[in-house]
């Protein structure tokens, strides 16, 4: 109500106002992954549940074909957790055999795709060497940060190995974004 | 101010407005845990500091008896970090003894309790196998995401083993939520 | 529009309104660290990129000399991820040599400095023992939480060992804050 006579003296409004409940928001949860093609040197993207259980999309934030679609420009907080699980990594097997022990790793990347730009942009990466002693291991990688996004941008979550993703519970592996 | 003549043309307001400083918020920090009963198959809940040091609750977000009480419906960002610490896990001892090496684990769950619903809902889980080589280990598990909550919902943090929680510093183990 | 006759009956505004786009915000990304002096018992602070690539500061949130400067009082969400990388930790070498195996560790601290207060305040700490089997290890530590800050407060990120910080990619190591 900037510059209006009837605004009370303490009113600090410098730009168009928005009701918070009207902002684009999404929380997506893990589903069992169906095998899909991906480019050789690119990590595969996860697909997600967008409405069942704890998952939701609202206020024009839509999900389709592994992508969250950004409906309006602004600053968004984006987050994801991926829980990985596996058997003993090669690293420890190699170690037992006395060979050089290059560690295995697990990686999560939150990627932005802009149609007008040829290359995807990696916004966030969490990467961890896995060199476990135990025969069965499991662990999460969490990411979250704020980014300036444009209307039409698309967000996805890529992982180093889809077969290691724990898809059993909606609280273990998830992906979300909200306009600040 | 949707549809009101005196709203300037750029005004984008679609719902009742809220001043951000008036929103329910809390940041709770770790305290030494007193032993309490918990059901056999349920992880014990942590209790928290709500006002000393870095901790606070405001705008009707109250803390009582291990629970954060949600004072109004809406979308909340909820987060927690729990730092665990321990001695060499059984896993590595078992491994040295040549027995099957089922890994130990550490787990944090942020749980929602709704009085009208008999079962608690697990909102977020971070779980990690612990199979450490060193005799003393320590590590954090961080969780954070957005959820649609209802007035009267209660939030708590459950852990797999209270005795492993590092309660020594308010910056190591904490729990918070804020209305978006 | 608290107390104004022309506010519609559903209007819930209890304090001065702020347009969200006008709020102080910053997302800083890693740069190669130049060696700098730091006090013997204090972890060194990282310096950051504030405008290139994904990094930005806006709405009077400024970055200078390793510090984010808080331009107005309020509740802020603050976050950081630091990715560490290293060679086999001493811990496993010591263990092989049969000596007591005090683990190495990696630590991130988000610290608040208030000019009127002599001691910095540790807001958030993520600390992890590193006792890796593999010869090359890497892993992130993520932190994020909400704090009440005052105009003039300064935020920095301290780490246990600057030489272990992965500065190669802006998506691996970052630091941000935004007014809620």
């Amino acid at each position: 109500l900037k510059g209006q006579e009837f605004a009370p003296s303490h009113q600090q409004v410098y730009a168009p106002l928005r009701a918070d409940g009207d902002k684009p928001r999404a929380h997506l949860t893990v589903v069992r992954q169906t095998p899909t093609q991906h480019f050789k040197n690119q990590f595969p993207a996860l697909h997600w549940e967008h409405e069942l259980g704890l998952a939701f999309t609202k206020n024009r934030m839509n999900y389709t074909n592994k992508f969250l679609l950004i409906p309006e420009s602004g600053d968004y907080f984006i987050y994801s957790q991926v829980t990985f699980r596996g058997m003993t990594s090669e690293c420890s097997e190699i170690r037992q055999a006395g060979r050089p022990n290059k560690p295995d790793s697990i990686t999560v990347v939150i990627t932005k795709v802009t149609d007008s730009y040829p290359e995807p942009t990696q916004l966030l990466m969490g990467t961890k060497s896995v060199c476990e002693v135990g025969s069965n291991w499991f662990q999460p990688i969490y990411l979250g940060a704020m980014f300036s996004l444009q209307e039409g941008d698309k967000l996805m979550v890529n992982v180093s190995d889809i077969s290691l993703v724990d898809y059993t519970k909606e609280d273990k592996t998830f992906f979300g974004a909200f306009l600040l | 101010l949707k549809g009101q003549e005196f709203a300037p043309s750029h005004q984008q307001v679609y719902a009742p407005l809220r001043a951000d400083g008036d929103k329910p918020r809390a940041h709770l920090t770790v305290v030494r845990q007193t032993p309490t009963q918990h059901f056999k198959n349920q992880f014990p809940a942590l209790h928290w500091e709500h006002e000393l040091g870095l901790a606070f609750t405001k705008n009707r977000m109250n803390y009582t008896n291990k629970f954060l009480l949600i004072p109004e419906s809406g979308d909340y960002f909820i987060y927690s970090q729990v730092t665990f610490r321990g001695m060499t896990s059984e896993c590595s001892e078992i491994r040295q003894a040549g027995r099957p090496n089922k890994p130990d684990s550490i787990t944090v769950v942020i749980t929602k309790v709704t009085d009208s619903y008999p079962e608690p809902t697990q909102l977020l889980m971070g779980t990690k196998s612990v199979c450490e080589v060193g005799s003393n280990w320590f590590q954090p598990i961080y969780l954070g995401a957005m959820f649609s909550l209802q007035e009267g919902d209660k939030l708590m943090v459950n852990v797999s083993d209270i005795s492993l929680v590092d309660y020594t510093k308010e910056d190591k183990t904490f729990f918070g939520a804020f209305l978006l | 529009l608290k107390g104004q006759e022309f506010a519609p009956s559903h209007q819930q505004v209890y304090a001065p309104l702020r347009a969200d786009g006008d709020k102080p915000r910053a997302h800083l990304t890693v740069v190669r660290q130049t060696p700098t002096q730091h006090f013997k018992n204090q972890f060194p602070a990282l310096h950051w990129e504030h405008e290139l690539g994904l990094a930005f500061t806006k709405n009077r949130m400024n970055y200078t000399n390793k510090f984010l400067l808080i331009p107005e009082s309020g509740d802020y969400f603050i976050y950081s991820q630091v990715t560490f990388r290293g060679m086999t930790s001493e811990c496993s070498e010591i263990r092989q040599a049969g000596r007591p195996n005090k683990p190495d560790s990696i630590t991130v601290v988000i610290t608040k400095v208030t000019d009127s207060y002599p001691e910095p305040t540790q807001l958030l700490m993520g600390t992890k023992s590193v006792c890796e089997v593999g010869s090359n290890w890497f892993q992130p530590i993520y932190l994020g939480a909400m704090f009440s800050l005052q105009e003039g407060d300064k935020l920095m990120v301290n780490v246990s060992d600057i030489s272990l910080v992965d500065y190669t990619k802006e998506d691996k190591t970052f630091f941000g804050a935004f007014l809620l």
Epitope: R32, E49, L52, G53, T64, Y167, K169, E170 | E119, Q122 | -
Partner: antibody
């Protein structure tokens, strides 16, 4: 191969309760990769989704607004089946009732379907 | 709730014809649109999922296209066994909803 087998009476009196069961083979009612649905079809309403039961971190149920006050869908993990109860039926509830699995793995669709049960509400 | 509208409601065609059925959603369902075929006395049978993916075992003469609110099912060359009723269905949001059907009859 997943199969669904429906059972239940074909005639129900007005004001009484319609009860149908759907037995699952080749999948589990407690799977977190599927939802278990009831759908009906009548000339006047076409295909109408009634509701579903499914597990994620816990059991969930969702119901169509048109029947929400009268419907219950319950899973039975011990028998690997799920049931439909529709209370206070009227002749407008006369329809062919189908159970169907909806696969939840990114894409989602109803497949397979039960064989269908024609339920007539009449005194 | 999302309403699904199919057109035409009925259609007469001959064996070998190319046939197109359209489906419109009242709001975007992104690509979450499925097509089913139903024959008298039988349950619906899945043909196409996520707008354009052919269910295994379904002949390649069936194809689907579209995204957002407008979708089409095309049968490139009608066969005698294709005379049936076809339904679109959105699986983007709850409650799930179906089109009213298109009855494909022999001319």
């Amino acid at each position: 191969q997943v199969q669904l087998q429906q059972s239940g009476p074909g005639l129900v009196k007005p004001s009484q309760t319609l009860s149908l069961t759907c037995a699952i083979s080749g999948d589990s009612v407690s799977s977190n990769s599927a939802t278990w649905n009831w759908i009906r079809q009548s000339p006047s309403r076409g295909l109408e989704w009634l509701g579903r039961t499914y597990y994620r971190s816990k059991l969930y149920n969702d119901y169509a607004v048109s029947v929400k006050s009268r419907i219950t869908i319950n899973p039975d993990t011990s028998k690997n089946q799920f049931s439909l109860q529709l209370n206070s039926v009227t002749p407008e509830d006369t329809a062919v009732y189908y159970c169907a699995r909806e696969v939840v793995a990114g894409p989602r669709w109803f497949d397979p379907w039960g064989q269908g049960t024609l339920v007539t509400v009449s005194s | 709730d999302i309403q699904m509208t199919q057109s035409p409601s009925s259609l007469s065609a001959s064996v070998g014809d190319r046939v197109t059925i359209t489906c419109r959603a009242s709001q975007s369902v992104t690509s979450y649109l499925n097509w089913y075929q139903q024959k008298p006395g039988k349950a619906p049978k899945l043909l196409i999922y996520t707008a354009s993916s052919l269910q295994s075992g379904i002949p390649s003469r069936f194809s689907g296209s579209g995204s957002g609110t407008d979708f089409t099912l095309t049968i490139s060359s009608l066969q005698p066994e294709d005379f049936a009723t076809y339904f679109c269905q959105q699986s983007y949001s709850t409650p799930r909803s179906f089109g009213q059907g298109t009855k494909l009859e022999i001319k």
